[in-house]
């Protein structure tokens, strides 16, 4: 899958949306590598 910074950001936004925002505080694009997905 796509591992560019923009792809990671959009994937994380989708994950946050689906989880209702209930994730760890440090779960942000610049802390999350593509392996998290």
């Amino acid at each position: 899958s796509c591992n560019t910074a923009t792809c990671v950001t959009h994937r994380l936004a989708g994950l946050l949306s689906r989880s209702g925002g209930v994730v760890k505080d440090n779960f942000v694009p610049t802390n999350v590598g593509s392996e998290a997905f």
Epitope: C7, A13, T30
Partner: antibody, heavy 119, light 107 residues
Framework: EVQLVQSGAEVKKPGASVKVSCKAS????????MNWVRQAPGQRLEWIGD????????NYNQKFKGRATLTVDKSASTAYMELSSLRSEDTAVYYC????????????WGQGTTVTVSS | DIQMTQSPSSLSASVGDRVTITCKAS??????VAWFQQKPGKAPKSLIY???YRYSGVPSRFSGSGSGTDFTLTISSLQPEDFATYYC?????????FGGGTKVEIK
Amino acid sequence: EVQLVQSGAEVKKPGASVKVSCKASGYTFTDYYMNWVRQAPGQRLEWIGDINPNNVGTNYNQKFKGRATLTVDKSASTAYMELSSLRSEDTAVYYCASIIIVPNYFDYWGQGTTVTVSS
Amino acid sequence: DIQMTQSPSSLSASVGDRVTITCKASQNVDTNVAWFQQKPGKAPKSLIYSASYRYSGVPSRFSGSGSGTDFTLTISSLQPEDFATYYCQQYNNYPYTFGGGTKVEIK
């Protein structure tokens, strides 16, 4: 309110360097990547590179590798793009841009900085 | 680098018209495409990400579709404020690349 405010217009001579700043506010600066894009007069947009303000990791367009340097000052929530060995073809408007998730999911852009390279 | 070829490069249309702009990638970019609107002297404004998702605040008359190599931006009913230049961008691979733009002019 999320804002990206860039430094003012610059006029440089060929061979010189320019450093453009982008001051971020309204969100956590270190949480999101910062992109730099330029647009020469009448031309398409051109991606220069991105920087992770958290660990200062960078990705560059090979076209600018060695001439462009992306840096950040975390304490000032400011990103910088320095371009060296300027030539007339570098005359363009330079933009910073960042896709933010919190507080608002949107792709925010700075207002642009005009860099003119002329002898 | 991935080439993004936009067509047409310009078009003339009237208020209320349906406008379609296409973008073709030189290789598969999945759905990792964005669309931007730019007015003279202004920064680009983001409209669409992931080929078909509108950012909050973007009017519903703007829609995007496509995957792989072929993408489309549609304006269902052109409004006076929509006359501008539109760009596609792929962010599937570094370096990110943009299409050459489509200028939408008043007929």
